[in-house]
């Protein structure tokens, strides 16, 4: 028996369902009574789901997994993982045994989009050219860790005095806070981009300083 899985990682959004595809080619006359199917975590060997002795043994992994029972006889051994969490990320191995056995691993990459950045300015009044200001760009509830870029109004990168911190919450999602310290010119636009490297999703925020008032 030969087991096939997708080579590319499966990308799943947090709180959505994901399908880890696995297939085999059944011989003519194959019956489910002959099939032993095991899904497990590749690294820890923890059992995730199994089908043995002709029946679905159910989920051994937080009751959020399911097979496609009607498709098993056609060689579809895919696993459905419901309500994906950050902690589900990793490699899963599909073992199929009929007379002989084979296995293959598939990677699950979890992702969550970042929110539109909010911009704050300190100080936020009585600003004059030559003042040092601190501009903070904050974006929330994303995964994995973001890439953060700052640009001026013409698109030139601002790489100087930037400090970026990323903190995971109890669900493993990141809140990102990036701080730019800059000396004000006569006027100027300061933009931050928060990029999710897995989703290739970009979230933009900007602040324009033209004396008063400020534009966010």
């Amino acid at each position: 028996v030969e087991v096939q899985v997708s080579e590319d990682p499966v990308v799943a959004l947090v709180d959505t369902d994901a399908t880890l595809r696995c297939s085999f080619s059944p011989e003519p006359g194959f019956s489910l009574a002959q099939l032993n199917l095991i899904w497990q975590l590749t690294d820890t060997k923890q059992l995730v789901h199994s089908f043995t002795e002709g029946r679905d043994q159910g989920s051994a992994y937080s009751n959020r997994t399911a097979l496609f029972p009607d498709l098993l006889v056609q060689g579809n051994a895919s696993l459905r993982l419901q309500r994906v969490r950050v902690t589900d990320e990793g490699s899963y191995t599909c073992f199929v045994s009929i007379q002989d056995f084979d296995s293959a691993a598939v990677s699950l990459q979890v992702a969550a989009p970042y929110s539109k950045p909010s911009m704050t300015l300190e100080p936020n009044k009585d600003l004059r050219p030559g003042n040092m200001v601190t501009i903070t760009c904050s974006s929330y509830q994303g995964y994995p860790e973001a890439e953060v870029f700052w640009k001026d109004g013409q698109g030139v990168p601002l790489t100087g005095n930037v400090t970026t911190s990323q903190m995971a919450n109890e669900r493993g999602l990141f809140d990102v806070h990036s701080v730019l310290r800059v000396v004000l010119g006569a006027n100027g636009t300061y933009s931050c981009l928060v990029r999710n490297p897995v989703l290739q999703q970009d979230a933009h925020g900007s602040v324009t300083i033209t004396g008063q008032p400020l534009t966010f």
Partner: antibody, heavy 121, light 108 residues
Framework: QVQLQQSGPELVRPGVSVKISCKGS????????IHWAKQGHAKSLEWIGI????????NYNQNFKGKATMTVDKSSSTAYMELTRLTSEDSAIYYC??????????????WGQGTTLTVSS | DIVLTQSPTTMAASPGEKITITCSAS???????LHWYQQKPGFSPKLLIY???NLASGVPARFSGSGSGTSYSLTISSVEAEDAATYYC?????????FGAGTKLELK
């Protein structure tokens, strides 16, 4: 019409410096950043850097740090790029181009005609 | 750096023929950040297509672009004599900005 006019061809000796100019016209020069790119003989394009034409803030490709210096003169709507310690490897056509994308998406809608630099002893 | 690999390196086409040039990125890029230029011998590059599929001002409708992820393409639906040129893809999804090595289109 919108255009970027570059200075003429340069033939220089190894070890010296050269300053290439790029004058914008037909638009508000200080509204758009200027990029510089290098095209070697029978070679592709290599991005050198970008300069803010309003305040002179600049950013360089790591490969050209210490080789290229970009400046701008707002009063004459001209961007400059100086290349130092020239070698035969620097012989190429150098282009300036106007940034037309958003802050985070760079592409070039107007290009100078190119300045041919030949470094030879 | 993100490397853009163009293929073919050179190609020849007859007037009226449909041709496709591909640009493969060494890592996934957002389609917003992939652009195409045309450069005729002795001239500066000219913006052809921006953000994968948007035609720049004045570019004939026979040019089109498509793609996502790591695979992008430029298509000329019916080649004309004036299309003989070198075509470059360019990305700014990853820093620094990079160009492909170019595809030279010759007319038969």
């Amino acid at each position: 019409q919108v255009q970027l006019q570059q200075s003429g061809p340069e033939l220089v000796r190894p070890g010296v410096s050269v300053k290439i100019s790029c004058k914008g016209s037909g638009y508000t020069f200080t509204d758009y950043a200027i990029h510089w790119a290098k095209q070697g003989h029978a070679k592709s394009l290599e991005w050198i850097g970008i300069i803010n034409t309003y305040n002179g803030n600049s950013n360089y490709n790591q490969n050209f740090k210490g080789k290229a210096t970009m400046t701008v003169d707002k009063s004459s709507s001209t961007a400059y790029m100086e290349l130092t310690r020239l070698t035969s490897e620097d012989s190429a056509i150098y282009y300036c181009a106007r940034n037309y994308g958003s802050s985070f998406n760079w592409y070039f809608d107007v290009w100078g005609q190119g300045t041919t630099l030949t470094v030879s002893s | 750096d993100i490397v853009l690999t163009q293929s073919p390196t050179t190609m020849a086409a007859s007037p009226g023929e449909k041709i496709t040039i591909t640009c493969s990125a060494s890592s996934s890029i957002s389609s917003n950040y992939l652009h195409w230029y045309q450069q005729k011998p002795g001239f500066s590059p000219k913006l052809l297509i921006y953000s994968t599929s948007n035609l720049a001002s004045g570019v004939p409708a026979r040019f089109s672009g498509s793609g996502s992820g790591t695979s992008y393409s430029l298509t000329i639906s019916s080649v004309e004599a004036e299309d003989a040129a070198t075509y470059y893809c360019q990305q700014y999804s990853g820093y620094p900005l990079t160009f492909g090595a170019g595809t030279k289109l010759e007319l038969k």
